[in-house]
């Protein structure tokens, strides 16, 4: 196709990427469901600079990430390494913290309101951001 | 003005298989995803499946999972439901439907006419 | 799953009726749902989506409310046209499911 030279309306453009980010909440993987419906994913934070941008963007509010531990190692949607990669976590966080009462431990990332990012219950209803990169976003797939 | 035409519809075999297809025209079709809904005669409706703008990312019902695929060319403005190892169950009308992302959920704002799916020996 | 479950399955009205259907899911779903109407032999109609948005072209007579688990779709004033099958759907999760139906008959 055809490269997409602007985000679709409603996203945000930034850093040759479009973000769009919700009002409401929903199950880490109901949003991570929702971004993909979008050709997106759950947004995937590689620098400092792109931490502030979103962080100004959903303010104080607990907010889902593309970045979950659920099948044992911390792993970005995107495919991103998480070992190397950029980290903003809360002093002692993640601590899959099993005191919640819900069942099992903490298995999905959120910025919580001073932006910083904690591990919780991913069926906690969470606003959400989706990403995609504009470059990407321009290109079909091949046909089955 | 939307509009989405079924095809591919009719007599199949139990274990056999169909390709349905819908033409969409009035909307740009590479931008929304698009569903498969279908409904058993006499009865309620039931989701199939969906996939994304650009085809990259599909769910299906867990009652077609496995047999059925979904996909589009958007060069051709198509969408398509491939179905295998067809069951007597599967006897519906099948509609495709438009997507449409409001506020952080999809819903299906335009519906085709539909095709009769019959699965009989 | 989540299972949307309607009351009442059918309901007997005049023209000028004020109708109401309830839609209940097993689990929340905030405000993740639509309100569909079917006529015989065609296609359904969206009404209502985010639970309470009413639908360019369909008439205002026509809303819904509810949050959570419990939804309302109510007809202010019952026209002719309006006698048909309505069905509500979870956007909430996949995968998608519907309510039953309810078949709003000339009493």
């Known amino acids: 196709g055809s490269e997409r030279t602007c985000c679709p309306v409603n996203w945000v453009e930034h850093e040759r990427s479009c973000y769009w980010f919700s009002r409401s909440g929903k199950a880490w993987a109901d949003a991570d469901n929702y971004c993909r419906l979008e050709d997106a994913h759950l947004v995937v934070v590689t620098s400092w600079e792109e931490q502030k941008f979103v962080q100004h963007h959903i303010g104080p509010v607990n907010t889902w990430m593309g970045l979950h531990d659920q099948n044992g190692p911390w792993k970005w949607v995107d495919g991103t390494d998480y070992e190397t990669g950029f980290k903003n976590w809360r002093p002692e966080q993640p601590d899959d913290w099993y005191g919640h009462g819900l069942g099992g431990g903490e298995d999905c990332a959120h910025f919580t309101d001073d932006g910083r990012w904690n591990d919780d219950v991913c069926q906690r209803p969470y606003r959400w951001v989706c990403e995609t990169e504009l470059d990407k976003a321009s290109q079909e797939p091949p046909l089955l | 003005e939307v509009q989405l035409l079924e095809s591919g519809g009719g007599l199949a075999q139990p274990g056999g298989s169909l390709r349905l297809s819908c033409a969409a025209s009035?909307?740009?079709?590479?931008?929304?995803?698009m569903s498969w809904v279908r409904q058993a005669p006499g009865k309620g409706l039931e989701w199939v499946s969906v996939?994304?703008?650009?085809?990259?990312?599909?769910y299906y019902a867990d009652s077609v999972k496995g047999r059925f695929t979904i996909s589009r060319d958007n060069s051709k403005n198509t969408l398509y439901l491939q179905m295998n190892s067809l069951r007597a169950e599967d006897t519906a009308v099948y509609y495709c439907?438009?997507?449409?992302?409001?506020?952080?959920?999809?819903?299906?704002?335009?519906w085709g006419q539909g095709t009769l799916v019959t699965v009989s020996s | 799953d989540i299972q949307m479950t309607q009351s009442p399955s059918s309901v007997s009205a005049s023209v000028g009726d004020r109708v109401t259907i309830t839609c209940r899911a097993s689990?929340?779903?905030?405000?993740?749902l639509a309100w569909f109407q079917q006529k015989p032999g065609k296609a359904p109609q969206l009404l209502i989506y985010?639970?309470?948005s009413l639908q360019s072209g369909v008439p205002s007579r026509f809303s819904g409310s509810g949050s959570g688990t419990d939804f309302s779709l109510t007809i202010s004033s019952l026209q002719p046209e309006d006698f048909a099958t309505y069905y509500c759907?979870?956007?909430?999760?996949?995968?998608?499911?519907f309510g039953q139906g309810t078949k709003v008959e000339i009493k």
């Open positions: 689990q929340g779903i905030s405000n993740w």
């Open positions: 985010a639970a309470s």
């Open positions: 439907a438009k997507g449409i992302a409001v506020a952080g959920s999809h819903y299906f704002d335009y």
């Open positions: 759907q979870q956007a909430n999760s996949f995968p998608w499911t």
């Open positions: 009035g909307f740009t079709f590479r931008s929304y995803a």
């Open positions: 996939i994304s703008g650009r085809g990259g990312n599909t």
